[in-house]
């Protein structure tokens, strides 16, 4: 007789998720290094050839702040969009009635630091729809689990997430 917790009768427990601490980033390397989101490839403007690399995200389960009233925050690379959509599901599962909220996506106004991945549509700043800061550490952890290549509990008011470039080998191989 196989005792409890052994053999085929073993129940798989869901992974215990630990919230990120304020100012923590995962992986524990600089954002624009190979082990994270990779190098900055250059600013994308509405007039540039690379603008077509950006795709709008109309996911109804995500709230976009769109403070510029231009729809810019909805624009992102496909990889960023995929990870964001995955995260939106996790957020609703984690906190019923709460949605993922994006405060910054692609930026064309120069509001970010030089060589920010926001200028390439590879970064988003996120909160929960209720703006409850006690949730942000766990939100960051969910972003890691959703597959963002670099997640940073950057501010008390948001989490910063970024992804590798579309043409990066690691991105294509799903690494």
């Amino acid at each position: 007789i196989i005792g409890p917790g052994r053999g085929f009768g073993k129940r798989r427990h869901p992974k215990k998720l630990t919230p990120l601490a304020y100012k923590q980033f995962i992986p524990n390397v600089a954002e624009k290094t190979l082990g994270a989101s990779g190098r900055y490839e250059g600013k994308i403007t509405r007039n540039s050839e690379r603008f077509k690399e950006l795709t709008p995200n109309y996911n109804p389960d995500i709230i976009f702040k769109d403070e510029e009233n231009t729809g810019a925050d909805r624009l992102m690379t496909q990889r960023c969009k995929d990870k964001l959509n995955a995260l939106a599901i996790s957020v609703m599962n984690q906190w019923p009635g709460v949605k993922l909220r994006v405060t910054e996506g692609w930026d064309e106004d120069g509001h970010h630091s030089e060589e920010s991945l926001h200028y390439e549509g590879r970064a988003v700043d996120i909160t929960t729809s209720d703006r409850d800061r006690s949730k942000y550490g766990m939100l960051a952890r969910l972003a890691v689990e959703a597959g963002f290549d670099w997640v940073y509990y950057e501010s008390k008011a948001h989490i910063h997430c970024s992804v590798k470039a579309e043409n990066s080998v690691a991105a294509k191989s799903g690494g």
Partner: antibody, heavy 123, light 107 residues
């Protein structure tokens, strides 16, 4: 030079009204959230009301809610505070102060203050 | 309503370090600003977002925020630092609130 100049203070009877103005100059007024903060004689600072830069958010302290109304005119670079049903406890110096945050996701503190205008509520 | 508590007064000798505390529930989830106000003058922002100094504010002013307590530290305190100091908290779901103020006396 970045400057905020308050006006409109004075002596008013309990139950009366006053309208304070704050004239801004030397910066892009529409890009900043604006605040009214008051200080009763010999007391500490008390936040009164805020008008966010996006014009989407207006906040009031519980002590003035329903009696005071904040407004702004970006074309005139001006902030206003309409004070109705004034009480003795509203007696204070009223300061206008700016902040570049939007009060929803960003807050940077009030980095420029006016010199204040005095409101006295007394019979 | 949310409350911030400061000691009414703090004394320090010239050249020594002054620490002014500000306490409130779950304060580390909020951003803290500190203001200096000298008699007859308007307040001046000396620290924002817990630890940042506006341009023109001397390096001897620093801030921290952990747990339920934020602290303004003035190292090498000078006579000109004698003033009232106010902490102020912000988060996206509560209005702005000021602490009661602390009178710093440089002995």
């Amino acid at each position: 030079e970045v400057q905020l100049v308050e006006s409109g203070g004075g002596l008013v009877k309990p139950g009366g009204s006053l309208r304070l103005s704050c004239a801004a100059s030397g910066f892009t007024f529409s890009s900043y959230s604006m605040n009214w903060v008051r200080q009763a004689p010999g007391k500490g600072l008390e936040w009164v009301s805020s008008f966010s830069s996006s014009s989407s958010y207006i906040y009031y302290a519980d002590s003035v809610k329903g009696r005071f109304t904040i407004s702004r005119d970006n074309a005139k670079n001006s902030l206003y505070l309409q004070m109705n049903s004034l009480r003795a406890e509203d007696t204070a110096v009223y300061y206008c102060a700016r902040d570049r945050g939007d009060y929803v996701d960003y807050y940077y503190g009030m980095d420029v203050w006016g010199q204040g205008t005095t409101v006295t509520v007394s019979s | 309503s949310y409350e911030l508590t400061q000691p009414p007064s703090v004394s320090v000798s010239p050249g020594q370090t002054a620490s002014i505390t500000c306490s409130g529930d779950k304060l580390d989830y909020k951003y803290i600003c500190w203001y200096q106000q000298k008699p007859g003058q308007s307040p001046v922002l000396v620290i924002y977002q817990d630890i940042k100094r506006p341009s023109g504010i001397p390096e001897r002013f620093s801030g921290s925020n952990s747990g339920n307590t934020a602290t303004l530290t003035i190292s090498g305190t000078q006579a000109m630092d004698e003033a009232d100091y106010y902490c102020q908290a912000w988060d996206s779901n509560t209005p702005l609130v000021f602490g009661g103020g602390t009178k710093l006396t440089v002995l």
